[in-house]
């Protein structure tokens, strides 16, 4: 629970508690913003980001955005609040422990995004269908 000596200031979004009343501590994420990447046509890639940050707010999760256009490939790694859209998309998979890439519709480029909620989980980004629950075969296995 929140210790009584830790003041809970008005509108304080820095103190977040879980269902047990324990204070939620922020997670660690890779945070290199946008960098050029060599990750292409692979089942998974490492971010090659050497910066691990303490997310500013405890509710933030790790996010990775992979983009490919005619000129280059970039990988973006950040912390972000899942209550807010990122690149105009909702972070649907924010509770996942792994960063499973999902394709999003963006004109003029190939755009994949993932989010996750374990320490440095956006260091390993996964494109492989075997991890993706939008795969009907996998859903069949899960529900059998």
């Amino acid at each position: 629970t929140i210790p009584p000596h830790v003041q809970k200031s008005v509108n304080n979004d820095m103190i977040v508690t879980d269902n047990n009343g324990a204070v939620k501590f922020p997670q660690l994420c890779k945070f290199c913003d946008v960098r050029f990447s060599t990750c292409d046509n692979q089942k998974s890639c490492m971010s090659n980001c050497s910066i691990t940050s303490i997310c500013e707010k405890p509710q933030e999760v790790c996010v990775a955005v992979w983009r490919k256009n005619d000129e280059n490939i970039t990988l973006e790694t950040v912390c972000h609040d899942p209550k807010l859209p990122y690149h105009d998309f909702i972070l649907e998979d924010a509770a996942s422990p792994k960063c499973i890439m999902k394709e999003k519709k963006k004109p003029g480029e190939t755009f994949f995004m993932c989010s996750c909620s374990s320490d440095e989980c956006n260091d390993n980004i996964i494109f492989s269908e075997e991890y993706n629950t939008s795969n009907p075969d996998l859903l069949l296995v899960i529900f059998q």
Partner: nanobody
């Protein structure tokens, strides 16, 4: 009973240094990550630094990177925060904290120690 007791706070001039200590008891100190968290007057919590159980992995908020150093001595059950090049905006109550983990769903906090940076 779990106890975290901070010490080392005080009044210091801008550019000066302080070393905070946190003595832990009542739990297996060496088996979990530890944090320094601060709260400036009338502000929310700021998560300053985190250290892994072996002391090998350390993490810092951008606001203190290059100025603060977190360390621990598991043989003495003590956590430290070396604060250099202090600024007025570092003025806050500094708390030593242990976050929830897979072995313990609870978070533990010290009573805090006040650091005032002023000329």
């Amino acid at each position: 009973e779990v106890q975290l007791l901070e010490s080392g706070g005080g009044l210091v001039q801008p550019g000066g240094s302080l070393r905070l200590s946190c003595a832990a008891s009542g739990f297996t100190f060496a088996q979990g990550d530890m944090w320094w968290v601060r709260q400036a007057p009338g502000k929310g919590l700021e998560w300053v630094s985190r250290i892994g159980m072996d002391g090998d992995k350390t993490y810092y908020a951008d606001s203190v990177k290059g100025r603060f150093t977190i360390s621990r001595d598991n043989s003495k059950n003590t956590l430290y925060l070396q604060m250099n090049s202090l600024r007025a905006e570092d003025t806050a109550v500094y708390y030593c904290a242990k976050g929830p983990s897979s072995t313990s769903p609870f978070d533990y906090w010290g009573q805090g120690t006040l650091v005032t940076v002023s000329s």
